[in-house]
C-alpha cells in the first residue's frame, strides 16, 4: 500500500478555494523528490496540472500552486477560482505519475444555492450553537414572534413567541424576545443536526405588514483532520469541544464499516480491549478540552476518529464532536520493539526503550500503565535518577545501548509486576512505544542470599550463583542507588579457559567488601551482560551492623555465602521471604545512602568470578 | 497468529541423522526467536535449543550439544534442527515453537544474546506446532 496520505474527498462551492494536504514519509530520498497533483482521465492515465518543479498546466494557471515543507513531510495543493469543471478524480503524489507512490482524491464542486435576497447564511459545525437574528419593525414589536423552516414550497413552524416549539427541537431552542427599545428578537439553536440544515424564515407580525428576513443555515460535519503517523509509535487527539459541555462525559470513538461509531475509550471508564494497556484518556481542562493518547500503532488502527461529549459518553445525533483521519505509516522509522518481554517470578527482565536517536540528550523515563477509568501512567523511573519508593532497589534505567536505545532494568519479579509499561522521552512524543511484562513458570537463572548482614570493619564475601549458559557472558556486581548501578572492581582471579567446558551445574561470582564500612549498606546486584546488552540481575540487601558482643549470634562475617536457596539468618535481622526484599526498612532501622564514588577507590570491594570447584577463573 | 508445522520424524537408527523443518505461516516470523522441544513418554517437556531471530545466537541443551544443530531460514520462513549421531534417549516427540524477541531487523534496536532470555522454559513460547516423532533404535 502507498505511503503517501491526503484527504479522499474535498468538497466545496464554485467561485471558492481548496487548499488540499498530502503526506509522506520523510526520507532524505522523499523530501527531494517531485511533487505532484494530477487529474485522471478516463484512459487512466493521469495528467499532471501542477508539480513542485514549477509546471503549472494551462487549466490551472494563475489560480494553483503547489507547496513542499520537506521538514513536515507534507506538500499542499492550492486550487482557487474552482468551477463545476473541476470536479473529479485525482492524484497526490511522488516521483513519476504511474509509479504508485500517490494518494487518490475526489474532488466535488457544487454549484452554490440560489438564495433570496439579503439572506444572512450562517455556517455552523454539527453540534454546536447557532443564534439567529430577527429584526422587526416599531409596529411589529408586540405582534407574534415566529421562524419558519422552508421546505420545497411549504413553511413549517419550528418556534414562535406563544411558547410552541416544534417537536424536532424539543429541549434545544428557545426565542428570545429583548426588553423595548431593541428591535430585534434572536433564535438560538443548540446541539445543531445534520438535519437542522436549510433556509429558515424568521416572521414578525401577520398580514402586509410583517417583517421577514431569510436565514441560510449550513451545518456541517467537521473536517476530518488529518493525522499521518508511524508504524510503533504513538498518537494524541487533542479535543476541544468548548465550555458548554466542560461538565458532560467525553469519548473518543472510531468510525466502522456500518458508519456508525464504537467507543474507543470515554471518562465513564469504557476502553476497547484492542487497545489495554496502550491508551490513556488525559485529565480534561477547565475548558473542557482532554486529550488522548494511543502508543504502539498498528495498520489496523487506521480509520476516522470522532472524539465527543454525551452523558452516555458515546456519540449521538446533535452534540459536538472533532473528527480526524489517522493514516498507518508501514514504511516507519521506529524499530520493531518488543511489545511483549517475559521474566521469571524472582527473576528480572531487561527492557530496550527505543527513542528518537537524533535527541540523545532528552530525559528518558519509564512508567506503568494503569487501566483504572481513564487510564494514567506513573513515573516509576527517570533518567535523571528519581525513583518510585516502592521500586527501590529493584528497578533501575540505563542509558545503554544508547543511538536510539536505553534500558530499563527490573528485578525481584512478582506476579503484581505483569502488566503494561510506557517507554517515553522529553522530546519526540510520536516515539512511545509500550511494553507488557509477563511472568512466566520458571526459576531465576542468577541465584544471590536473601539477606546479608555485614560486620562493621570486618570482610564481607557475597556470592552469585550463575548457569553454564551465562559462562562466556560479562559477570558484574554493581551496587543499586537511584541514579542507576555503580559497577564494583573486578578481579580476574585466573585463566578465562576456565568456562570454557562448563559441565558443573552452576558458576560462582562472589562481591567482597573489605572492611565494611557504614557506606557498603544498601543493595547490591548481580547480573551478566554483553558489552552494553544487560541480562539477567539478581538483587541482595546488605545490612550493616556494630560488631557484636561476645556471646551473640551472627553470619560470619568473612562469608556470606549460603547455598542459593537458604536463608541467611542473624540475630538483627527476622527472616523475610525474597519477594518481600522491596524496602530497606524491613532490614535496617538505619538507612545510610551509599556514596557512590567511594566504590572505586582502593581494594576494599571486589568481585571475584570463580567455579563453584576451583579458584580458576575471571568475570570476563 | 502463527501457525507451525513440523516435518522430517521418523525411524533411524542410533549414530544415525535425521533433519527436522519447522514452517511458520506469519509475516511476523523474522520477528520470533524459535525454538525446539522434545518430550518423551512419560517425561515432561524438555528444552532442546533455540535461534535467535536473525540466526545470529543460538543456545543449545547440554544433552544435545556438539551433535544438534538449529538454523533457519527466514526468507522460507522455517527453521531447521539438523540431528547428527542420535543415541536411544533422543526418541521423543519433537516440537517447533516460537516467541517474540526482544530486538528487531530495524535499526536502533539491536539483538540481545538469547541467552539472556528464559527461553529455556516452555511458558516463554507463544506458538506451538503438534509435534513430530522421531524413534531412534538400537
Known amino acids: 500500500k502507498s505511503p503517501v496520505f491526503g484527504p479522499q474527498e474535498v468538497s466545496s462551492v464554485e467561485g471558492n478555494s481548496v487548499s488540499i494536504k498530502c503526506y509522506y514519509p520523510p526520507t532524505s530520498v522523499n523530501r527531494h523528490t517531485r511533487k505532484y497533483w494530477c487529474r485522471k482521465g478516463a484512459s487512466g492515465r493521469c495528467i499532471t496540472l501542477v508539480s513542485s518543479e514549477g509546471y503549472v498546466s494551462s487549466n490551472y494557471a494563475g489560480r494553483a500552486n503547489l507547496t513542499n515543507f520537506p521538514e513536515n513531510g507534507t506538500f499542499v495543493v492550492n486550487i482557487a477560482q474552482l468551477s463545476r469543471d473541476d470536479s473529479g478524480h485525482y492524484k497526490c503524489g511522488l516521483g513519476i505519475n504511474s509509479r504508485g507512490l500517490s494518494f487518490d482524491v475526489s474532488l466535488e464542486v457544487s454549484q452554490g444555492p440560489e438564495l433570496p435576497n439579503g439572506t444572512e447564511v450562517y455556517t455552523v459545525d454539527v453540534g454546536r450553537t447557532v443564534t439567529i437574528k430577527c429584526p422587526f419593525k416599531t409596529e411589529n414589536a408586540p405582534k407574534t414572534k415566529a421562524l419558519y423552516k422552508k421546505i420545497g414550497q411549504t413553511s413549517v413552524l419550528v418556534i414562535d413567541s406563544r411558547n410552541y416549539v416544534n417537536p424536532n427541537y424539543k429541549d434545544r431552542i428557545r426565542l428570545r424576545i429583548p426588553g423595548t427599545g431593541q428591535l430585534i428578537f434572536t433564535v438560538v439553536i443548540d446541539r445543531l443536526r445534520l438535519s437542522d440544515h436549510g433556509l429558515y424564515l424568521c416572521q414578525a407580525g401577520d398580514g402586509s405588514n410583517r417583517d421577514e428576513k431569510n436565514a441560510d443555515l449550513q451545518v456541517l460535519e467537521p473536517e476530518p483532520e488529518l493525522v499521518y503517523e508511524d508504524l510503533r509509535g504513538s498518537v494524541t487527539f487533542h479535543c476541544a469541544l468548548g465550555l458548554e459541555v466542560a461538565n458532560v462525559a467525553k469519548f473518543l470513538c472510531r468510525v466502522n464499516s456500518r458508519e456508525t461509531c464504537d467507543v474507543v475509550i470515554n471518562t465513564l471508564g469504557k476502553r476497547d480491549s484492542a487497545f489495554e494497556g496502550r491508551i490513556l484518556l488525559n485529565p480534561q481542562d477547565k475548558d473542557g478540552s482532554f486529550s488522548v493518547v494511543i502508543t504502539g500503532l498498528r495498520k489496523e488502527d487506521e480509520g476516522r476518529y470522532l472524539c465527543g461529549a454525551h452523558s452516555d459518553g458515546q456519540l449521538q445525533e446533535g452534540w459536538p464532536i472533532q473528527a480526524w483521519q489517522l493514516f498507518v505509516n508501514e514504511e516507519s522509522t521506529i524499530p520493531r520493539s518488543p511489545t511483549v518481554v517475559k521474566g521469571v517470578a524472582g527473576g528480572s527482565v531487561a527492557v530496550l526503550c527505543p527513542y528518537n536517536p537524533k535527541e540523545s540528550q532528552s530525559l528518558k523515563y519509564w512508567c506503568l500503565w494503569e487501566g483504572a477509568q481513564n487510564g494514567r501512567c506513573p513515573l516509576l523511573v527517570e533518567s535523571q535518577g528519581l525513583v518510585q519508593e516502592q521500586y527501590e532497589g529493584r528497578l533501575s534505567l540505563l542509558q545503554e545501548p544508547g543511538n536510539g536505545t536505553f534500558t530499563v532494568i527490573l528485578n525481584q519479579l512478582t506476579t503484581q509486576d505483569a502488566g503494561f509499561y510506557w517507554c517515553l522521552t522529553n522530546g519526540d512524543t510520536r516515539w512511545r512505544t509500550t511494553v507488557e511484562i509477563k511472568i512466566i513458570e520458571g526459576e531465576p537463572n542468577l541465584k544471590v542470599p536473601g539477606n546479608v548482614t555485614a560486620v562493621l570493619g570486618e570482610t564481607l564475601n557475597i556470592p552469585c550463583h550463575f548457569p553454564c549458559k551465562f559462562s562466556s557472558y560479562e559477570k558484574y556486581w554493581c551496587k543499586w542507588s537511584n541514579t542507576g548501578c555503580q559497577t564494583l572492581p573486578s578481579q580476574d582471579e585466573g585463566p578465562s579457559e576456565a568456562f570454557v567446558n562448563c559441565d558443573e551445574n552452576s558458576r560462582l561470582v562472589s562481591l567482597t567488601l573489605n572492611p565494611v564500612t557504614r557506606a557498603d549498606e544498601g543493595w547490591y546486584w548481580c547480573g551478566v551482560k554483553q558489552g552494553h546488552f544487560y541480562g539477567e540481575t539478581a538483587a541482595v540487601y546488605v545490612a550493616v551492623e556494630e560488631k557484636k558482643v561476645a556471646g551473640s549470634r551472627y553470619v560470619s562475617p568473612a562469608k556470606a555465602d549460603a547455598a542459593p536457596d537458604e536463608k541467611v539468618l542473624d540475630s538483627g535481622v527476622r527472616e523475610i521471604e525474597n519477594k518481600a526484599i522491596q524496602d530497606p526498612r524491613l532490614f535496617a532501622e538505619e538507612k545510610v545512602v551509599a556514596d557512590t564514588g567511594d566504590q572505586a577507590g582502593g581494594s576494599r570491594a571486589s568481585v571475584d568470578s570463580s567455579s563453584s570447584e576451583e579458584q580458576g577463573g575471571s568475570s570476563k | 497468529q502463527v501457525q507451525l508445522v513440523e516435518s522430517g520424524g521418523g525411524l533411524v537408527q542410533a549414530g544415525g541423522s535425521l533433519r527436522l523443518s519447522c514452517a511458520a505461516s506469519?509475516?511476523?516470523?523474522?520477528?520470533?526467536?524459535m525454538g525446539w522441544f522434545r518430550q518423551a513418554p512419560g517425561k515432561e517437556r524438555e528444552f532442546v535449543a533455540v535461534?535467535?531471530?536473525?540466526?545470529?545466537?543460538?543456545y543449545y541443551a547440554d544433552s544435545v550439544k556438539g551433535r544438534f544443530t538449529i538454523s533457519r531460514d527466514n526468507a522460507k520462513n522455517t527453521v531447521y534442527l539438523q540431528m547428527n549421531s542420535l543415541k536411544p534417549e533422543d526418541t521423543a516427540v519433537y516440537y517447533c515453537?516460537?516467541?517474540?524477541?526482544?530486538?528487531?531487523?530495524?535499526?536502533?534496536?539491536?539483538?540481545?544474546?538469547?541467552?539472556?532470555?528464559?527461553?529455556?522454559?516452555?511458558?516463554?513460547?507463544?506458538?506451538w506446532g503438534q509435534g513430530t516423532l522421531v524413534t531412534v533404535s538400537s
Open positions: 535461534i535467535s531471530w536473525s540466526g545470529g545466537s543460538t
Open positions: 506469519g509475516r511476523t516470523f523474522s520477528s520470533y526467536a
Open positions: 515453537a516460537s516467541g517474540e524477541q526482544p530486538g528487531s531487523n530495524r535499526p536502533y534496536i539491536p539483538e540481545q544474546p538469547i541467552e539472556f532470555m528464559p527461553t529455556d522454559y516452555p511458558s516463554w513460547y507463544d506458538y
